[in-house]
Interface confidence: low
Amino acid sequence: YFGKLESKLSVIRNLNDQVLFIDQGNRPLFEDMTDSDCRDNAPRTIFIISMYKDSQPRGMAVTISVKCEKISTLSCENKIISFKEMNPPDNIKDTKSDIIFFQRSVPGHDNKMQFESSSYEGYFLACEKERDLFKLILKKEDELGDRSIMFTVQNED
């Protein structure tokens, strides 16, 4: 069971300092952006991270949403990352959900995060290059020191 707490607005970057944004096709991508680029591309670069209390404490449970025309929420259904047109719900009556991720910070670095899927244990949000695009994907963590699953989260509010 997950119960919604507060939400915050955040900019999410990978460890190469590329900014996560939603492109016109609603795809989550990373791109090099200056701070002014990041502002100019808002709200596509501003993510709503909603925190949830978890009946089985396993780390901070969160959803990641974006509000362009409508609110879309990140989902990892079938291990495929996509934004689904939906508000983060107030309650989720299950111990797993495709939209809930466990956010954990690196010790001593509260802004450096990893996001583990609540549906697929051991699978993390990651940045992966595919041709010329840097995509947000769900990836099974199977190697130590994997930079691709680490992100910085900068609060905007």
């Epitope: 460890l15 089985q56 396993r58 954990r104 690196v106 010790p107 001593g108 670095h109 450096k112 990893q114 583990e116 244990e121 051991g122 993390f124 963590e141 190697e143 130590l144 020191g145 994997d146 930079r147 699953i149 680490m150």
Partner: antibody, heavy 120, light 107 residues
Framework: QVQLVQSGAEVKKPGSSVKVSCKAS????????ISWVRQAPGQGLEWMGG????????NYAQKFQGRVTITADESTSTAYMELSSLRSEDTAVYYC?????????????WGQGTLVTVSS | DIQMTQSPSSLSASVGDRVTITCRAS??????LNWYQQKPGKAPKLLIY???TLQSGVPSRFSGSGSGTDFTLTISSLQPEDFATYYC?????????FGQGTKVEIK
Amino acid sequence: QVQLVQSGAEVKKPGSSVKVSCKASGGTFSTFSISWVRQAPGQGLEWMGGIIPIFGTANYAQKFQGRVTITADESTSTAYMELSSLRSEDTAVYYCARGGYGGYYYFDYWGQGTLVTVSS
Amino acid sequence: DIQMTQSPSSLSASVGDRVTITCRASQSISNRLNWYQQKPGKAPKLLIYKGSTLQSGVPSRFSGSGSGTDFTLTISSLQPEDFATYYCQQHYQWLTTFGQGTKVEIK
């Protein structure tokens, strides 16, 4: 092949400090964590703290907070552990170990150990 | 802090025996558990990580199982080189902790 080579044995007086080094070779240094684990004679393993060189800041077990300092020099791929205000109970073998910083945090490579003896 | 309790603290066994060591966490740690082997005067060696994944180069007679709070390390057929001390380690929290160890001795 990854190797962690530690500095040699030390004999120290109570109240003094000791600094042990751990030089990594054969693999990426910055994107892994380096932890320090100690083992008193005839006792079990005790995690002291660790550092992720790429991020810089260390974190420590509560027991050692304020008395241990862990640092890393990326240019030489070397991690350091300094323990201050030494007492006889700090006599132990000190190991460095390479770990991750993602969801899984296991130590796949270890240094050979450095014996620190605290005696007046 | 999460406490790890290993049992037994020591055991005597013969070559060829099946040996089981258990490790219990004070709260659920999912599969965030590792097993190490240590011989006198040597550094620990990683055997199993993520609860049940065999580290490369470790003989298949070693296996790990369990999830949540209860975990087991099994040696299916004890060999002379397996006489050593075995430690579990949790890393559900960044502040990782080890069990107190299980010494496997020759009967």
